[in-house]
């Protein structure tokens, strides 16, 4: 029976945090950073943050953008600072051109 390999401590990254889930914090620490855009009753809601555990974001980050949600993930300190997720557009970008950042 093969010995189980010792688990290495995963690298944690500092991420920009923006949106409802951040409370009063403007950053968080996790194994992946993300920037997301979703639609809430006609408003586009942008959020940024981190996945504490890699598996937590594994499926989310692999999901291709849809008309209702887009998530971009990255690994690296503050790597989501200048990432703004965008919904896919077909030709002319109307009417997917509104965004609303919930604090």
């Amino acid at each position: 029976m093969e010995d189980e390999k010792p688990k290495v401590n995963p690298k944690l990254y500092m991420c920009v945090c923006e949106g409802l889930s951040c409370g009063n914090e403007d950053h968080c620490e996790g194994q992946q950073c993300f920037s997301s855009l979703s639609i809430n009753d006609g408003f586009h809601v942008y959020q940024k943050g981190c996945f504490q555990v890699y598996e937590q974001g594994k499926m989310t980050c692999k999901t291709p953008p849809s008309p209702g949600q887009a998530v971009e993930c990255c690994q690296g300190d503050w790597c989501n600072r200048n990432i703004t997720a965008q919904l896919p557009t077909k030709g002319k970008s109307f009417p997917g051109t509104q965004n609303f950042h919930l604090e």
């Epitope: 109307f94 965004n99 604090e103």
Partner: antibody
Framework: EVQLVESGGGLVQPGGSLRLSCAAS????????MSWVRQAPGKGLEWVSA????????YYADSVKGRFTISRDNSKNTLYLQMKSLRVEDTAVYYC?????????WGQGTLVTVSS | DIQMTQSPSSLSASVGDRVTITCRAS??????LNWYQQKPGKAPKLLIY???SLQSGVPSRFSGSGSGTDFTLTISSLQPEDFATYYC??????????FGQGTRLEIK
């Protein structure tokens, strides 16, 4: 073709009321948030009010809070702005626009003049 | 409320010039900054959204950059149809949504 057409503007005395309408076509109106933005003669742009796609959430600039009411009728693809207790400083071209954040497209505007 | 300050308030330039307009936010707004062009008697037109994304149909001579509090709109080679008033607008915070005071671009 996506189109927004405002109507209902005109001359009104201070203290008076007016209701603006914005007829939308060319897109699924109920899916999108909408806003009113105004521009006083020779001045810049001022956001006035916004409403969510369902009409369940509304937002107002402090300058119009308590006097203006935004609403929508998704069955008629129409956005409204009910304006009461109008003041001279409300004189402006009023535009409706898709979304409460980056605005696109815009209507052609309707002029509201508040004067005695 | 987040205040938006544009500079200059007006400028004169010639066809072919490279022009830069700046917009400063009173607090960090990440990249939630949009730019509009308005010609006299007309409704504003969206040029740039999310600081640097060019709106569909807008000529590539227009570009936007910046993040945090400082942003710029650049017109690489001014064309006669570009003489207009330009506005920045933040979409970071929940309402009120705020615009800059505008920059009037005139022919020299």
């Amino acid at each position: 073709e996506v189109q927004l057409v405002e109507s209902g503007g005109g001359l009104v005395q201070p203290g008076g009321s007016l209701r603006l309408s914005c007829a939308a076509s060319g897109f699924t109106f109920s899916t999108y948030a909408m806003s009113w933005v105004r521009q006083a003669p020779g001045k810049g742009l001022e956001w006035v009010s916004a409403i969510s796609g369902s009409g369940g959430s509304t937002y107002y600039a402090d300058s119009v809070k308590g006097r203006f009411t935004i609403s929508r009728d998704n069955s008629k693809n129409t956005l409204y702005l009910q304006m009461k207790s109008l003041r001279v400083e409300d004189t402006a071209v009023y535009y409706c626009a898709n979304s409460p954040s980056w605005f696109d497209p815009w209507g052609q505007g309707t002029l509201v003049t508040v004067s005695s | 409320d987040i205040q938006m300050t544009q500079s200059p308030s007006s400028l004169s330039a010639s066809v072919g010039d490279r022009v830069t307009i700046t917009c400063r936010a009173s607090q960090s707004i990440s990249s939630y900054l949009n730019w509009y062009q308005q010609k006299p008697g007309k409704a504003p037109k969206l040029l740039i959204y999310a600081a640097s994304s060019l709106q569909s149909g807008v000529p590539s001579r227009f570009s936007g950059s910046g993040s945090g509090t400082d942003f710029t709109l650049t017109i690489s080679s001014l064309q006669p149809e570009d003489f207009a008033t330009y506005y920045c607008q933040q979409s970071y915070s929940t309402p009120p949504i705020t615009f800059g005071q505008g920059t009037r671009l005139e022919i020299k």
